[in-house]
């Protein structure tokens, strides 16, 4: 989390509530669509 | 040092099409989402759509749904907003936006582009 | 969709006064409350991220506070440029909202 412009965290932790598909879904940049497939990957 | 450059605004009929654009420098525009955010004359601002890296996400206000679309050209380093079937509520200045991801506050904002829907 | 409500919608004040403005969203929204200033004709500029972060190159005469649902934009001591209208925005959620804006009048 974090919500600032300069924070360096990309959603390292999931949120509350927070799913692998809803960050699919709300990711935009290129930083937050790798972390997704990282997950994907350590999940198998 | 970042800029986002906007054309493409004017005067156009209801029901009539245009399509606004954003050059994007000095950063690596396609590494990251790109937002459209309007204000109708004398009122505030509303959100109108993002765009993911990629093109892989699109989230778009209900208000436009169906009748805008968000595109990117990574080649081009350009943002573009399709506008089909104006209406006269559609009469604004339209901000093209960058931030770093999903719940990420805007650093920069374009200059602006006044769309006015009338006949 | 999260509301989100600012108040007042206009203030008058005078030159180095103390200026509060308070943004309230219909549900919790964490930190994700960015400020902005906008002045006639001219694109929105960033002021805070994260409810209380300063954007760089945003003078420290504005700070933010508030976490969840209850937000405060305070400017310590008005200067002639800061006459303008403020917007809070919560990027907690699609669709991202705005408040209606405060317009800060010179007294």
């Known amino acids: 989390g974090g919500g600032g412009s300069k924070h360096k965290c990309f959603r390292k932790d999931l949120e509350q509530n927070e799913t692998l598909e809803s960050i699919m879904s709300t990711a935009e940049s290129e930083e937050e669509l790798k972390r997704y497939f990282y997950y994907l990957e350590g999940s198998k | 040092q970042v800029q986002l450059v906007q054309s493409g605004g004017g005067v156009v009929q209801p029901g009539r099409s245009l399509r606004l654009s954003c050059a994007a420098s000095?950063?690596?525009?396609?590494?990251?989402?790109m937002h459209w955010v309007r204000q109708a004359p004398g009122k505030g601002l509303e959100w109108v759509a993002v765009?993911?890296?990629?093109?892989?996400?699109?989230h778009y206000s209900d208000s436009v749904k169906g009748r805008f679309t968000i595109s990117r050209d990574d080649s081009k380093n350009t943002l573009y907003l399709q506008m089909n079937s104006l209406r006269a509520e559609d009469t604004a200045v339209y901000y093209c936006?960058?931030?770093?991801?999903?719940?990420?506050?805007?650093?920069?904002w374009g200059q602006g582009t006044l769309v006015t829907v009338s006949s | 969709d999260i509301q989100m409500t600012q108040s007042p919608s206009s203030l008058s004040a005078s030159v180095g006064d103390r200026v509060t403005i308070t943004c309230r969203a219909s549900q919790g929204i964490s930190n994700y409350l960015a400020w902005f200033q906008q002045k006639p004709g001219k694109a929105p500029k960033s002021l805070i991220y994260g409810a209380s972060s300063l954007q760089s190159g945003v003078p420290s005469k504005f700070s933010g506070s508030g976490s969840g649902t209850d937000f405060t934009l305070t400017i310590s001591s008005l200067q002639p440029e800061d006459f303008a209208t403020y917007y809070c925005q919560q990027y907690n959620s699609y669709p991202l909202t705005f408040g209606g804006g405060t317009k800060v009048e010179i007294k």
């Open positions: 936006a960058k931030r770093e991801g999903y719940r990420y506050a805007y650093d920069y």
């Open positions: 000095g950063f690596s525009f396609s590494s990251f989402g």
């Open positions: 765009i993911s890296y990629g093109g892989i996400n699109k």
